[in-house]
């Protein structure tokens, strides 16, 4: 099916930018992996690069405005022709749910004091208004609450005095049309306009002042233009060459408003002076290689020694990574394929341990399933041996950092009947539903 093709994908917002045009296939649009596409206008924007997870969205508002609630955030698998980590198809959403508390307490209403006295009337003649007020302190509201109703009220008041009305001009009426619209006619064109003393009229009792000045105004029509000539388009010029060497580009044709040129205020040519077309090089754009994440560290060993575990003997270990996705003469990955470091092996070593403080509360799991809960833990943490943190391997090469490696066997006193992990669970409250934000916008 044809799609809308764009030249940019904005990672921060997930929006398509720089519309190239419609009516092309996903495969043709994605000849350039920097491009992006939409299946319909306003629909989900997918970049042409290989799929990966978007940034997490911001946390949604807390499901309640006071006391403890829950909130969701999501990320989306975006890209084309592949899957995200976890073998997830493009377009799929992943959710996280956490507990939240916007405000510890909930608002409580206050009560009004009695009304104060009426203030004087707002005018000295005719009718006006007067006002009285009351205070929200009987009792005062708590935790951001308020009192129901208004803090002041007004009513009409009459001074029993008549006010004089002074006359004022209404706005000028329009100029009457000139007798000719182009210059060169037999009569000298004139135009006239008038106004009324009606905004307002002056009062009789008590007497108001009349409007100052004249009710009519006349002038000569000057500077009339010569009669106009409308502009007309010349022929379309040649099509510009395709500006790209791979993927899709945009060519342009131009025309000039000179057939004839507009004169004496005649209208400019209607329509566009340029028009564009999509051009297809049919050449896929280079795709640069990208490093996979580092693999696991190999076991910590020392040559010609069977085992160095639980000993103050430094060894070496390495890890590797793979350059993936390079196609169509793209750049190879920069940097090293292998990483080597010095290490002490504490694999399966019995070490004295101590209980950690409680961890922070984890995310609510499952985020979209029934009855989500959150947990926190205390872990039996090993006390690492006080081996030298650096070693000098070869003279003249300086000191090298040494890292502990392996899973030791920590020993702690029993805590709540447990030797390694103590866990506390708690239900998540006021859980909102997981809804696709793209579908919510429709």
């Amino acid at each position: 099916d044809p799609v809308l093709c764009f030249t940019q994908y904005e990672e921060s917002s997930g929006k398509c930018k720089g519309l190239l045009g419609g009516g092309v296939s996903v495969e043709d649009c994605c000849l350039n992996t920097a491009f992006a596409y939409q299946k319909r206008s306003g629909g989900l924007c997918q970049p042409c690069r290989s799929p990966r997870w978007s940034l997490w969205s911001t946390w949604a508002p807390c499901s309640v405005t006071c006391s403890e609630g829950s909130q969701l955030r999501y990320r989306r698998c975006v890209g084309w022709n592949g899957q995200c980590s976890g073998k997830v198809a493009p377009g799929t959403l992943e959710w996280q749910l956490q507990a939240c508390e916007d405000q510890q307490c909930c608002p409580e209403m206050g009560g009004w004091s009695g009304w104060g006295p009426w203030e004087p009337c707002s005018v000295t003649c005719s009718k006006g208004t007067r006002t009285r007020r009351r205070a929200c302190n009987h009792p005062a509201p708590k935790c951001g609450g308020h009192c129901p109703g208004q803090a002041q009220e007004s009513e009409a008041c009459d001074t029993q005095q008549v006010c004089p009305t002074h006359g004022a001009w209404a706005t000028w009426g329009p100029w009457t049309p000139c007798s000719a619209s182009c210059h060169g006619g037999p009569h000298e064109p004139k135009e006239t306009r008038s106004r009324k003393c009606s905004a307002p009229e002056p009062s009789q009792k008590p007497p108001g002042k009349p409007c100052p000045g004249l009710a009519y105004e006349q002038r000569r029509c000057t500077g009339l233009p010569p009669c106009p000539v409308a502009g007309g388009w010349g022929p379309w010029g040649p099509v510009s060459p395709c500006p790209v060497t791979c993927g899709l580009g945009q060519t342009m044709e131009q025309r000039t408003c000179n057939h004839p040129v507009p004169q004496h205020g005649g209208p400019f040519c209607a329509g566009d002076a340029t028009r564009t077309h999509i051009c297809n090089t049919a050449v896929p754009c280079p795709v640069d290689g990208e490093w996979d994440s580092w693999g696991e560290w190999s076991p910590c060993i020392r040559r010609n020694m069977k085992s160095i575990s639980c000993q103050e003997i430094p060894g070496q270990q390495s890890r590797g990574r793979t350059c993936r996705g390079r196609k169509f003469d793209g750049h190879r990955c920069a940097g090293q394929q292998q990483d080597i470091r010095h290490c002490y092996s504490i694999q399966h070593c019995p070490l004295k341990g101590s209980w950690s403080e409680w961890s922070t509360w984890g995310l609510c799991m499952p985020p979209c399933g029934p009855n989500p809960t959150r947990a926190r833990q205390r872990l039996c943490t090993p006390l690492l041996p006080k081996y030298p943190p650096t070693v000098s391997m070869v003279e003249g090469q300086g000191e090298k950092n040494v890292t502990f490696w392996g899973r030791p066997l920590p020993r702690c006193e029993e805590l709540q009947g447990q030797k390694l992990v103590v866990e506390e669970k708690r239900p998540c409250l006021h859980v909102p539903a997981c809804k696709d934000p793209e579908e919510e916008e429709l």
Partner: nanobody, 119 residues
């Protein structure tokens, strides 16, 4: 049994032309995307050109764009590659292949035909 049989290779001088053919059988040729892939002596395979199932869309590597033309005849179950303005660096065994040219996942390959460009 799927079969892809290439022909039309040979020795040609620089600047000359050749037309390669690939006869297909054992699968629905008219609904398959097809590609030409070449392998020069001592090098890895290099994608050259691709065509979609109905022949409406064609694609080329930058190194051959404007000199090579891919086409197909679904009535004859045959794929073609017209090669003009040949250069010594075009010397390779040329294979026709069926599958996804973009991800380079090919399901079936031919046995190949040798093209030598030499003065």
């Amino acid at each position: 049994e799927v079969q892809l049989v290439e022909s039309g290779g040979g020795l040609v001088q620089p600047g000359g032309s050749l037309r390669l053919s690939c006869a297909a059988s054992g699968f629905t040729f008219g609904s398959a995307d097809m590609s030409w892939v070449r392998q020069a002596p001592g090098k890895g395979p290099e994608w050259v050109s691709a065509i979609n199932s109905n022949g409406g869309s064609t694609y080329y590597a930058a190194s051959v764009k404007g000199r090579f033309t891919i086409s197909r005849d679904n009535a004859k179950n045959t794929l073609y590659l017209q090669m003009n303005s040949l250069k010594p660096e075009d010397t390779a065994v040329y294979y026709c292949a069926q599958g996804n040219w973009y991800t380079e996942e090919y399901h079936y390959w031919g046995q190949g035909t040798l093209v030598t460009v030499s003065g």
